[in-house]
Interface confidence: low
């Protein structure tokens, strides 16, 4: 069957009908509905929302909508024994305590179940000691402290500002430095944009606002007690001592009012340079400990949170494909929030809801997609991408054989300046072509395409006249699909102007102030940016599910592979003597990339010419495109990270949010000059080049003529 036979509408009209059905007013209504009470993972409230979404997706017209539940490790504060940090004097008396909760926003004073700020999965403990300020607690910050400043963090409590890198990496770095506790805080330099008022009068973070978040280092494992397998009724669970990724030292987050009280007394070394200074009226001294008058005072943490196995619920909706029901295009985003989830995740969930409604409307008119579309409302994303990972673990055999693409749908906005897209190179052309067909919502671009405003505001650093598209990292639910299973993935949202706003994320991220009103008053009153994101995400799903030939261009992979090979080679060439001594050559990698480029080019020519009315040949060519991403998966995974199996991309070992290219080689080269056994270290570089070259060559061969 051609896709025309699957439908009573012409293909061109299909997409138009789908896009025209998406309405900003509906997204607004859904966002309001999803944000009136907290929906913390593992709570009754979030279960109720799952059942509501299940019911509404059925009403919208999906073929089936099921709840998939798992019993996973979550973490909660002790309701009767709150977490806090104090300054204690020499007698052990608490002379200052940090706040126990955020002042609730107007209109929410009587809402129950607002979980107080905490670092999820922190162990219990009451460490006390001197404070050391460690800037952002990045790898390079600890290098500066330990190697240049000769400051020892062993046995100290460190205080780090949020931003730049995933908080779990900060905690891991602090642990490796020997710290016995970590305090995380939001500095106004990173979370208070100049010229904007604090919530509720603007979108900036007030002094009492605090960012919640998990501090795990899961490296793609999912539930810490059942790595690799679903946390189902008959699961074998590890003991807590063997759990994956749990921090070993107490951690707690605070706002900048409380941080001021801790940092203003800091003594010891001055900050090494201006990049270590935030915007508080404090010296940003590194320590250790407090200055002269206060030198006998210490900091004490009081952490009483508990880790508990708790039931979570994904909602999985199916719209069966008419021609290729065994090929799955997945649109997924999470439902659980830290508190109200005004942006994260409900601005995304509301968009997914409207996309489902539009697809359902078309289905009720007699249309079906060519391929099956799966819609997912994931649970427990905030606790380590748990819902999506457990479902993918449970369904891995189906997904690796049938998964065409995964489109992520967390927060639709993190600003209102321009589009931001991270995706596999296979989707570059799809994104370009789609955004050329969509209207820009931006002021000053009336009547212009989204592609035009996006390219103007966020130009590609390499190709003029094209927009920037970034690598996929992690920190969201596409991780298991892309990094573990090798399913082509992408994500899109509206973002801020990174040039003028250098704060990290958006100021109210994971705070109680992330409300419906934040979005409706300050970010997107007309919901036009939400609508645009719905059109991009929905349009991508539509094309992936409905186009006769999959809208993947393998030539774009060839281009980036060459760029990444050049980059990693230039990093290695910072050590020319060692490369010579240990006979390190990148010839095999460059040769494989060259072969890939030639084979991809020939494949693309065949793709133009083949007989699309022959269903066997069509299916064969589409399968080669579908399985290309899969061909970059190494079943053995990356060193010490078995669930990161993509050889071309992985989350950075220093920042989970960022993507790294040729991560195996990159990590082998990282800080190689400090390795105690250079011969062994350079041997590992050579092994990683071998793995990368082999993988690229093997992937190229999947695109060759089959016989």
């Amino acid at each position: 069957k051609s896709s025309n036979e699957a439908t009573n509408i012409t293909p061109k009209h299909n997409m138009k009908a789908f896009l025209d059905e998406l309405k900003a007013e509906n997204i607004k209504k859904f966002l309001y509905n999803f944000t009136q009470i907290p929906h913390l993972a593992g709570t009754e409230q979030n279960f109720q929302l799952a059942k509501q979404i299940q019911s509404q997706w059925k009403e919208f017209g999906l073929d089936s909508v099921e709840l998939a539940h798992y019993d996973v490790l979550l973490s909660y504060p002790n309701k009767t024994h709150p977490n806090y940090i104090s300054i204690i004097n020499e007698d052990g008396n608490e002379i200052f305590n940090t706040s126990l909760f955020e002042p609730p926003p107007p209109g929410y004073e009587n809402v129950s179940d607002i979980v107080p700020p905490f670092s999820a999965f922190s162990p219990q403990g009451m460490p006390e000691g001197d404070l050391v300020y460690v800037n952002y607690a990045r790898t390079e910050d600890f290098f500066k402290l330990e190697r240049d400043m000769k400051i020892n963090c062993s046995g100290k409590i460190v205080i780090a500002r949020y931003g730049k890198v995933f908080r779990g990496n900060k905690v891991k770095n602090a642990q490796l430095a020997g710290a016995k506790g970590v305090i995380l805080y939001s500095d106004p330099a990173d979370y208070f944009a100049p010229g904007v008022k604090s919530y509720p009068d603007g979108w900036n973070l007030p002094g009492g606002g605090v960012q919640r978040g998990n501090i795990l280092n899961l490296n793609g494992a999912g539930d810490p007690l059942t790595p690799g397998y679903p946390a189902n009724e008959y699961a074998y669970r590890r003991g807590i001592a063997e759990a994956v990724g749990l921090p070993s030292i107490p951690v707690h987050p605070i706002g900048y009012y409380d941080a001021q009280k801790l940092l203003e007394k800091m003594g010891g070394s001055a900050p090494p340079d201006s990049s270590w200074r935030g915007s508080l009226k404090v010296p940003y001294n590194v320590g250790p400990g407090f200055t002269g008058n206060f030198s006998t005072q210490k900091v004490k943490m009081h952490i009483h949170s508990t880790n508990e196995v708790t039931r979570i619920y994904n909602v999985i909706g199916t719209l069966r494909g008419a021609v290729e029901p065994d090929r799955y295009v997945i649109l997924g985003g999470h439902r659980d929030s830290w508190v109200f989830g005004g942006i994260d995740p409900q601005s995304g969930a509301a968009v997914v809801h409207e996309i489902v409604r539009s697809f359902g409307t078309l289905k009720k008119e007699g249309w079906r997609p060519r391929r099956t579309i799966l819609f997912a409302s994931w649970d427990a994303e905030e606790f380590g991408l748990l819902g999506s990972t457990e479902w993918a673990e449970e369904n891995s055999r189906l997904l690796q054989e049938r998964g065409v693409a995964y489109i992520n749908a967390d927060s639709s906005i993190e600003g209102n300046y321009t589009l931001r897209v991270d995706c596999t190179p296979l989707m570059y052309s799809l994104v370009h072509n789609l955004t050329k067909e969509l209207k820009s919502p931006d002021e000053g671009f009336e009547g212009k395409s989204l592609y035009e405003s996006w390219t103007k505001k966020s130009p590609s650093p390499e190709f003029s006249g094209m927009p920037r598209i970034s690598k996929l990292g992690s920190g969201n639910d596409f991780e298991v699909f892309f990094q573990r299973l090798g399913i082509a993935s992408g994500r899109a949202r509206y973002t801020k102007n990174w040039e003028t706003n250098k704060f990290s994320g958006y100021p109210l991220y994971h705070s109680v102030y992330e409300t419906y009103e934040l979005v409706e008053k300050f970010y997107d009153p007309m919901f036009k940016y939400h609508l645009t994101v719905a059109q991009v995400r929905g349009g991508m799903v539509f094309e992936l599910a409905n186009s006769i030939v999959l809208p993947f261009d393998c030539r774009d992979y060839a281009v980036v592979l060459r760029k990444y090979a050049d980059k990693i080679y230039s990093i290695s060439m910072k050590h020319p003597q060692e490369m010579k001594t240990y006979s390190v050559s990148f010839d095999s990698l460059f040769s494989a990339v060259k072969n890939f480029t030639e084979i991809a080019s020939k494949f693309s020519e065949r793709l133009q010419d083949f007989d699309k009315s022959n269903p066997i040949v069509l299916r064969m060519m589409n399968d080669q495109l579908m399985f290309l991403e899969r061909a970059f998966i190494d079943p053995l995974g990356l060193p010490d990270r078995p669930f990161y199996r993509h050889v071309i991309y992985a989350p950075s070992s220093h920042n989970k949010y960022a993507g790294e290219s040729f991560p195996g080689i990159y990590d082998a080269l990282f800080d190689i000059e400090s390795k105690v056994d250079p011969s062994k270290a350079w041997g590992e570089v050579k092994r990683q080049i071998y793995v990368a070259a082999f993988t690229v060559q093997a992937a190229a061969e999947t695109l060759s003529e089959v016989a």
């Epitope: 909660y76 129950s112 708790t310």
Partner: nanobody, 126 residues
Framework: QVQLVESGGGVVQPGRSLRLSCAAS????????MGWVRQAPGKEREFVAA????????LVSDSVKGRFTISRDNSKNTLYLQMNSLRAEDTAVYYC???????????????????WGQGTQVTVSS
């Protein structure tokens, strides 16, 4: 604040049945878990049963399992405890308790920070 008023207690012979009710009033929005706790003379309070707002999660203590059933009518803001095959050891003051929901696995635990009724006396005696 939330007010809880129990009713339905009384004196009953062993093997017979009673149905306790607990009417909730006041700001009941956000009360996600309700349950029953009993206290026999000279003994500690003992958990009997709990039910989540949806009724999807129910827990009954081993000592009353198979005999007592907990249920809830959200439209009437009322909690029930159907007690069958009563025994002398079921004699106690039965308290209704309500919580904004304790996070996670311990959702059924009630403590002093939760809402409590005044209690209703159940006496099982021949």
């Amino acid at each position: 604040q939330v007010q809880l008023v129990e009713s339905g207690g009384g004196v009953v012979q062993p093997g017979r049945s009673l149905r306790l009710s607990c009417a909730a009033s006041g700001r009941t929005f956000g009360i996600y878990v309700m349950g029953w706790v009993r206290q026999a003379p000279g003994k500690e309070r003992e958990f009997v049963a709990a039910i989540s707002w949806s009724g999807s999660d129910r827990l009954v203590s081993d000592s009353v399992k198979g005999r007592f059933t907990i249920s809830r009518d959200n439209s009437k803001n009322t909690l029930y405890l159907q007690m069958n095959s009563l025994r002398a050891e079921d004699t106690a003051v039965y308290y209704c308790a309500a919580s904004n929901r304790l996070y996670g696995r311990t959702w059924y635990d009630f403590n002093e920070s939760d809402y409590w009724g005044q209690g209703t006396q159940v006496t099982v005696s021949s």
